[in-house]
Amino acid sequence: ALDTNYCFSSTEKNCCVRQLYIDFRKDLGWKWIHEPKGYHANFCLGPCPYIWSLDTQYSKVLALYNQHNPGASAAPCCVPQALEPLPIVYYVGRKPKVEQLSNMIVRSCKCS
Amino acid sequence: ALDTNYCFSSTEKNCCVRQLYIDFRKDLGWKWIHEPKGYHANFCLGPCPYIWSLDTQYSKVLALYNQHNPGASAAPCCVPQALEPLPIVYYVGRKPKVEQLSNMIVRSCKCS
């Protein structure tokens, strides 16, 4: 699997999950999240060559099409597969609220 | 929705489904599919600017991050959302078989 265990410990050039830390204030301009100040969001990056972690029947067809037609615009793209939630604290007036923001952290990628 | 109804009738530059016809023999080198000879597979293409058909909480965060950090490698990618099956006929020995190949035709796209 193209997950953090494999990707963070390798020099994989193809589609893989990469490290990305997002600071809510500096990177997004968000002041409303009290805690945490930022988080390891990660992101997906890398080419999707023939047979590389293909998601669907369509992505297999497209990867083979791309292999035979390398100049074509049509090619699979490296995108998140498994996402995890992030617990945050924010304020409603003076009252702190704890919430789980779903699908916030990328754990693995796929070629779609 | 970034579907064939909208995308095929517009000159949309952002993420949208685009027309692509795949000839099984010419484009993939496949002889095993007897019918059809090819099909309208389509594909997804176009940039994913802030707020453009974003898929998850994460893709919203990433699009905003990308807005603030335009030089960054981390950006959402335009990929298939709704896929449809394709009925095919192929032969096992001399016996024709009809099969539905799932997830073969792109009907709409999303920024993931």
Partner: nanobody, 118 residues
Framework: EVQVVESGGAAVQPGESLRLSCAAS????????MGWFRQAPGKQREMVAI???????NYADSVKGRFTISRDATKNTVYLQMNSLNPGDTAVYYC????????????WGQGTQVTVSS
């Protein structure tokens, strides 16, 4: 049970030739796109060549003009003829089969070692 089995790996000297074979189960061979991949020590697995059931081939730039992939439907076998071998070709060579029917899958063999050294 679907099986993909490679053979033909050996130790050779630079400039020599070698032919690898890959036998696949008859149930998948006729519709499969067959491929040879290789993995050198400490490197990622990379595509060497692929061949479709219609005989369409595709090669990695590093092997073009030296390697030839072919298939024999009567024997359910794919071959990789490797000429002008050099030390950079040293790797474990894997055969695979990409199928859409009767099941959408990618089947891999166990690999065969090719060593090119003087």
């Amino acid at each position: 049970e679907v099986q993909v089995v490679e053979s033909g790996g050996a130790a050779v000297q630079p400039g020599e030739s070698l032919r690898l074979s890959c036998a696949a189960s008859g149930s998948i061979f006729n519709t499969a796109t067959m491929g040879w991949f290789r993995q050198a020590p400490g490197k990622q697995r990379e595509m060497v060549a692929i061949i479709t059931d219609g005989g369409r081939t595709n090669y990695a730039d590093s092997v073009k003009g030296r390697f030839t992939i072919s298939r024999d439907a009567t024997k359910n076998t794919v071959y990789l003829q490797m000429n002008s071998l050099n030390p950079g070709d040293t790797a474990v060579y894997y055969c695979n089969a990409l199928t859409i029917v009767p099941r959408s899958s990618i089947y891999w063999g166990q690999g065969t070692q090719v060593t090119v050294s003087s």
